[in-house]
């Protein structure tokens, strides 16, 4: 079925929501004053070999659990990330965006990445797809 303007708009809104969530996480942790940043950077994330289509969000979905574990270190009284809720929201968006009709096997790059590199990669992906929709 060809994408309608309403489905394109919905996809764009979902991607913008995903983008905002990823940017919020990055801004929350990537602060040189964050006491835990250096230790958070010791965690490694798998990066997609290729990320150009919505189906490639499978690669993000598979790394959401490790992401939640690292975000559990990032809380403070004035910065309520609530990792479980945040990751749950991202998971819902990712599932809707990538669709469940076809099974896609994610291919990962050989080199692992830090949480900052990982988030930046998926932020760039979201921005890129949004730009093709507008």
């Amino acid at each position: 079925m060809a994408p309608t303007s309403s489905s394109t708009k919905k996809t764009q809104l979902q991607l913008e929501h995903l983008l905002l969530d990823l940017q919020m996480i990055l801004n929350g942790i990537n602060n040189y004053k964050n006491p835990k940043l250096t230790r958070m950077l010791t965690f490694k994330f798998y990066m997609p070999k290729k990320a150009t289509e919505l189906k490639h969000l499978q690669c993000l979905e598979e790394e959401l659990k490790p992401l939640e574990e690292v975000l559990n270190l990032a809380q403070s009284k004035n910065f309520h990330l609530r990792p479980r809720d945040l990751i749950s929201n991202i998971n819902v968006i990712v599932l809707e965006l990538k669709g469940s009709e076809t099974t896609f096997m994610c291919e990962y790059a050989d080199e692992t990445a830090t949480i900052v590199e990982f988030l930046n990669r998926w932020i760039t992906f979201s921005q890129s797809i949004i730009s093709t929709l507008t």
Epitope: P35, R39, T42, F43, E69, L73, Q75, K77, N78
Partner: antibody, heavy 121, light 111 residues
């Protein structure tokens, strides 16, 4: 019982290499960072560096960078601290400790018993 | 690196005494409303043991006679009624900035 058990005391000559160990038990070793702390005779405590046993990622105190290497083998729940060429000034007690950083905190909740390293000609 | 200055460096006290140890940081160890300051006890020939984390939280299993307070740059460890097993060296530690640093220690001896 959650514990970290370190290898026994070592007596070495200057220039020799050494690798001491810290074995975790009673918890998921890969899920917690392990830190190394030095205590020179009659002195205070100095943080050396940290390893994430799950990923192998490390971070060092600038003072110890290039002087020691921190590694881990998660399959046997063990972290290591090694020297390629010991100096007399490396004589100290070395502790491994488990880092806890969930929520609003960052502290060492479990410590190894310590490994005494003596370097003398 | 953040410097932690403990005072006094050592003192003598008797069982039952109220003991106060201070730790002053060269800059704030607070981050977004939380104090990244911990206290450890070390007995001769033994590894340090966690007493207090995040300035005022008592570690599980540590007697309630130990308490911690403070924020920013000034912190205090208090032992409300000194017991024989409390004669040891006490260290404060900041975990707000790398490298993590410890105070020089305060040795509590029997009078």
């Amino acid at each position: 019982e959650v514990q970290l058990v370190q290898s026994g005391a070592e007596v070495k000559k200057p220039g020799e290499s050494l690798k001491i160990s810290c074995k975790g038990s009673g918890y998921a070793f890969s899920n917690y960072l392990i830190e190394w702390v030095r205590q020179m005779p009659g002195k205070g405590l100095e943080w050396m560096g940290v390893i994430n046993p799950g990923s192998g990622g490390t971070y060092y105190n600038e003072k110890f960078k290039g002087q020691v290497t921190i590694s881990a083998d998660k399959s046997i729940s063990t972290a290591y601290l090694q020297w390629s060429s010991l100096k007399a000034s490396d004589t100290a007690m070395y502790y491994c400790a488990r880092w806890r950083g969930e929520g609003y905190y960052a502290y060492y909740d479990v410590w190894g018993q310590g490994t005494t390293v003596t370097v003398s000609s | 690196a953040i410097r932690l200055t403990q005072s006094p460096s050592s003192f003598s006290a008797s069982t039952g005494d109220r003991v106060t140890i201070t730790c002053k940081a060269s800059q704030s160890v607070d981050y977004q409303g939380d104090s990244y300051l911990n206290w450890y006890q070390q007995k001769p020939g033994k590894a340090p043991k966690l007493l207090i984390y995040a300035a005022s939280n008592l570690e599980s299993g540590v007697p309630s006679r130990f308490s911690g307070s403070g924020s920013g740059t000034d912190f205090t460890l208090t032992i409300s009624s000194l017991q024989s097993e409390d004669f040891a060296t006490y260290y404060c530690q900041q975990s707000n900035e790398d490298p993590y640093t410890f105070g020089g220690g305060t040795k509590v001896e029997i009078k």
